[in-house]
Amino acid sequence: EEELQVIQPEKSVSVAAGDSATLNCTVSSLIPVGPIQWFRGAGPGRELIYNLKEGHFPRVTAVSDPTKRNNMDFSIRISNITPADAGTYYCVKFRKGSPDVELKSGAGTELSVRAKPS
């Protein structure tokens, strides 16, 4: 059985303030069943950025339809970027359970924010 891979192809992304940022993430397998969540930061203090199941994420949308059968693209778009959004973002696969169990993280994508061109 091939090991699940969580692929974040870009090590870094630079976006002008006010623009949208797309953070790409794909998984190599539909198995095991379980959600993908996005976080900023890697330690215990990491911030939840997007969780399809529940939560309040007004500036974050899924690029593909995550409810679509056989979807393996879990990229997100963050709108109206500000300097406070800078940081390293991780796409993380969980195994469905009670609670869900963290399986594998992507390598992370560092988001940097440029000043808005005048």
Epitope: G41, A42, P44, G45, L48, G87, E102
Partner: antibody, heavy 117, light 108 residues
Framework: DVQLVESGGGVVRPGESLRLSCAAS????????MTWVRQAPGKGPEWVSL???????YYADSVKGRFTISRDNSKSTLYLQMNSLRAEDTAVYYC???????????WGLGTLVTVSS | EIVLTQSPGTLSLSPGERATLSCRAS??????LAWYQQKPGQAPRLLIY???SRASGIPDRFSGSGSGTDFTLTISSLQSEDSAVYYC??????????FGGGTKVEIK
């Protein structure tokens, strides 16, 4: 505006229990790790415990096995159950919001716990 | 556990003078060091993070520097409202998150 309001402090005898609460508002509580930090009279702050956004818990060695941190995202409330209290647990207990890079960016006003026989 | 040692214990200066506070870590923390200000009866307030980045709303008279094990908080021109205790904190990814013992800044 972010607000954190602790409650539940008081005077107890050694060996007794207390449960602290922290009501949060002004931010999406479920998206952030939360922590308890205490400060004994005249001393510096001491990190006590943390609960992550996925409800994983972490404790300082000094409270491990005696204190339990938990969160109720539906109520935007953080808790600290403190059992087998000791005189050295006497302190002001603050709850704080943690940023993604492990900074304590907002603190409550604190609640005083006094353990004395 | 990383131990943070602050010096001096107390600093007594006049308004307009420059205050230099030191924090030394028992092992390297890279640039992951923060400074907090605490006034009597209040909770600590974040001033500086990542050694030299000012937190939102913090006046530019506060600046931080250093990396590895040796860090400095500088208040370029002391004002009366800067009278407080200042704590350093290492903010590497994993607990325990440790604080220094503090430096008390008194305004003469």
């Amino acid at each position: 505006d972010v607000q954190l309001v602790e409650s539940g402090g008081g005077v107890v005898r050694p060996g007794e229990s207390l449960r602290l609460s922290c009501a949060a508002s002004g931010f999406t509580f479920s998206n952030f790790a939360m922590t308890w930090v205490r400060q004994a009279p005249g001393k510096g702050p001491e990190w006590v415990s943390l609960v992550s956004v996925t409800a994983t818990t972490y404790y300082a060695d000094s409270v491990k096995g005696r204190f339990t941190i938990s969160r109720d995202n539906s109520k935007s409330t953080l808790y600290l159950q403190m059992n087998s209290l000791r005189a050295e647990d006497t302190a002001v207990y603050y709850c704080a919001k943690i940023t993604w890079n492990n900074l304590f960016d907002y603190w409550g006003l604190g609640t005083l716990v006094t353990v004395s026989s | 556990e990383i131990v943070l040692t602050q010096s001096p214990g107390t600093l007594s200066l006049s308004p307009g003078e420059r205050a230099t506070l030191s924090c030394r870590a028992s092992q390297t923390v890279g640039s992951k060091l923060a400074w907090y200000q605490q006034k009597p009866g209040q909770a600590p307030r974040l001033l500086i993070y990542d050694s030299s980045s000012r937190a939102s709303g913090i006046p530019d008279r506060f600046s931080g520097s250093g990396s590895g094990t040796d860090f400095t908080l500088t208040i370029s021109s002391l004002q009366s409202e800067d009278s407080a205790v200042y704590y350093c904190q290492q903010h590497n990814d994993w607990p325990p998150y440790t604080f220094g013992g503090g430096t008390k800044v008194e305004i003469k």
